[in-house]
């Protein structure tokens, strides 16, 4: 189809080096078309159309993205070509950043229903830079945390070096929507509830004599407790003796529940005891088995593949351990009898 | 910085339009509101412009102001002035939907048969 | 609509003494934090002194602090001097940013 009728609109990801960040594109389609389509509540009480001749359909995953080879060949299908992009919706996704992914991407609606629609298409043209200057030494990450119960605040990553007199209008989204009260460079939060996690894009404009376009970043937000106080609890075992079949095969479980830490670097192993002699078991890898806001349950086993008379005088000791400190259960094996 | 003008002396009814001049800084990248305040009264908040071009009324302003801008000014049209409308406007650049550091001198409007 | 509701005029303060100004918001302000404070003098247009409720404007001496959440702030101006005679202003911003407004100012007479 033809492109040049086409709005246009022109982004510039500037990415960091040191992190892993992601990248997103609205399909903006131009007023009044979109208001069949997608961010239908992006639409200001002022925007909004007396005549709407784009009949698409409401379905919000009705687009169509493409990428412009810069060679001048036909449009490339995203989904086909480009495994690191996923369309959510109307939203294309960047899972991975890096310069190759500068170009032209084009979204138009699946369904051509009416002869208007046929010029109801966006391009935009992405730039993307790594980031160069380190004029701001203390710039905001692309994964920032809000404490619950408390005050926090999202900061826009490439603006969080301005102070609020000098910032610009940021456009904020929050999960594709648009949030309309927010024009500052920072989202600040009285009380921060779970309901503030999520994605936010903030966007703001810069120009030059020749020409503007939206510098945009991409926020992952998530709402935390604060770290915990305590070492962690072994859960199980419970007990300190087990009892056991001699020559058959035993797996002994250790859980764990470590509390929330920011910095989260777990320790769950098990060593044995044998007389004056200790030393680590090479045992399965550690699992999570359950996780909540608070604390995540963690299992390790160890196991036998059968046990022998030696193992009766061996303590197997399991040790868990947080930044706080560590707790260790050990449980000694016992025969059955009868 | 920001200046308005255009304000003078005009009879009930005939439109008026306001003029806010900005320097130093583009509205492209900032958000601008329209406050004024009556003879011996107080502020009142009559809307903004978001650098998008989308415009936000109190809800006593509707349908009696209109915003508008272009690439240096933002300009407030007074659709049909009534007496009451006699006041000193403001315009001011915009921080997060309020009124922020920069604001005009201001000028004058009277409305008066 | 909202309405944002001041201490009544005047408000009397001895220089170096405190006073407080109260300004009450119905609904509560968007994040419960979006109100700011202006200073306003004869002849000049209004001056920001807070914003965010509690967030000092830049130049704004530390004699003022806003505080308050939701629908209840105060702007307190401890060590009240002979230049802090002037009209304070409140101001809302709300999730629906046509209600957004001031109140009708609070005049500080200084002795």
């Known amino acids: 189809f033809n492109i040049s009728g086409c709005s246009t609109k022109k982004l510039l990801w500037t990415y960091s080096t040191r992190s892993e960040e992601e990248f997103v594109l609205f399909c903006d389609l131009p007023e009044p078309q979109k208001s069949h389509f997608c961010h239908r509540n992006r639409l200001s009480p002022k925007q909004v159309p007396e005549h709407l001749p784009f009949m698409g359909s409401n379905d919000l995953s009705d687009v169509q993205w493409y990428q412009q080879p810069s060679n001048g060949d036909p449009l490339e299908d995203i989904r086909k070509s480009y495994p690191h992009i996923i369309q959510d919706k109307c939203t294309l996704h960047f899972l991975t950043p890096g310069v190759n992914n500068s170009g032209s991407y084009i979204c138009r609606p699946k369904m051509i229903k009416s002869p208007y629609d046929v010029a109801c298409c966006v391009k935009m043209i992405l730039e993307v830079k790594p980031q160069t200057n380190a004029s701001c030494e203390y710039s905001a990450s692309h994964k920032q945390d809000l404490l619950l119960g408390s005050t926090g605040s999202i900061s826009c990553p490439s603006l969080s070096c301005q102070s609020d007199a000098q910032s610009p209008a940021v456009t904020w989204y929050k999960n594709g929507k648009l949030l309309s009260v927010e024009r500052s460079n920072r989202i600040v939060v009285d009380e921060v509830y779970d309901y503030h996690q999520g994605t936010y894009v903030c966007d703001y404009t810069q120009s030059d004599t020749v020409s503007s376009w939206t510098v945009r970043a991409v926020v992952q937000v998530r709402t935390i407790v604060g770290d915990t106080k305590l070492k962690p609890d072994i859960l199980d075992p419970v007990e300190d003796t087990l009892e056991v079949e001699l020559g058959k095969p035993l797996t002994i479980s250790c859980k764990a529940r470590f509390g929330f830490e920011r910095v989260f670097n777990p320790v769950i192993k098990w060593y044995i005891k044998d007389s004056d002699l200790e030393w680590e078991v090479s045992v399965p890898e550690a699992k999570s088995i359950k996780s909540t806001l608070k604390d995540e349950i963690i299992e390790r086993n160890i196991i036998l593949e059968k046990v022998t008379q030696r193992d009766l005088r061996r303590k197997f000791v399991c040790f868990v351990q947080n930044s706080i400190g560590n707790t260790t259960q050990s449980v000694q094996l016992k025969e059955k009898r009868g | 910085s920001v200046e308005e003008s255009g304000g003078r002396l005009v009879t009930p009814g005939t439109p008026l339009t306001l003029t806010c001049t900005v320097s130093?800084?583009?509205?492209?990248?900032?958000?601008m509101s329209w406050v004024r305040q009556a003879p011996g009264k107080g502020l009142e908040y009559i809307g903004i412009?978001?650098?998008?071009?989308t415009t936000y009324y109190a809800n006593w302003a509707k349908g009696r102001f209109t915003i508008a801008k272009t690439s240096t000014t933002v300009n407030l049209k007074i659709t049909s002035p009534t007496t009451e409308d006699t006041a000193t406007y403001f315009c001011?650049?915009?921080?997060?939907?309020?009124?922020?550091?920069?604001w005009g001198p201001g000028t004058l409007v009277t409305v008066s048969l | 609509a909202a309405v944002l509701t001041q201490t009544p005029s005047p408000v009397s303060a001895a220089v170096g003494g405190t006073v407080s100004i109260s300004c009450q918001s119905s609904?509560?302000?968007?994040?419960?934090?979006?109100l700011s404070w202006f200073q306003q003098k004869p002849g000049q247009p209004p001056k920001l002194l807070i914003y965010?409720?509690?967030t000092l404007a830049s130049g704004v001496p530390s004699r003022f602090k806003g505080s308050g959440s939701g629908t209840q702030f105060t702007l307190t101006i401890s060590d009240v001097q002979c230049d802090d005679a002037a009209t304070y202003y409140c101001?809302?911003?709300?999730?629906?940013?046509?209600?957004?407004?001031f109140g009708r100012g609070t005049e500080v007479v200084v002795k």
């Open positions: 001011a650049r915009t921080h997060n939907t309020l009124p922020f550091y920069i």
């Open positions: 101001a809302g911003g709300y999730s629906s940013i046509s209600d957004n407004g």
């Open positions: 412009i978001y650098n998008s071009g």
């Open positions: 130093g800084f583009s509205l492209n990248s900032y958000d």
């Open positions: 965010y409720a509690s």
């Open positions: 609904p509560s302000v968007y994040n419960n934090n979006r």
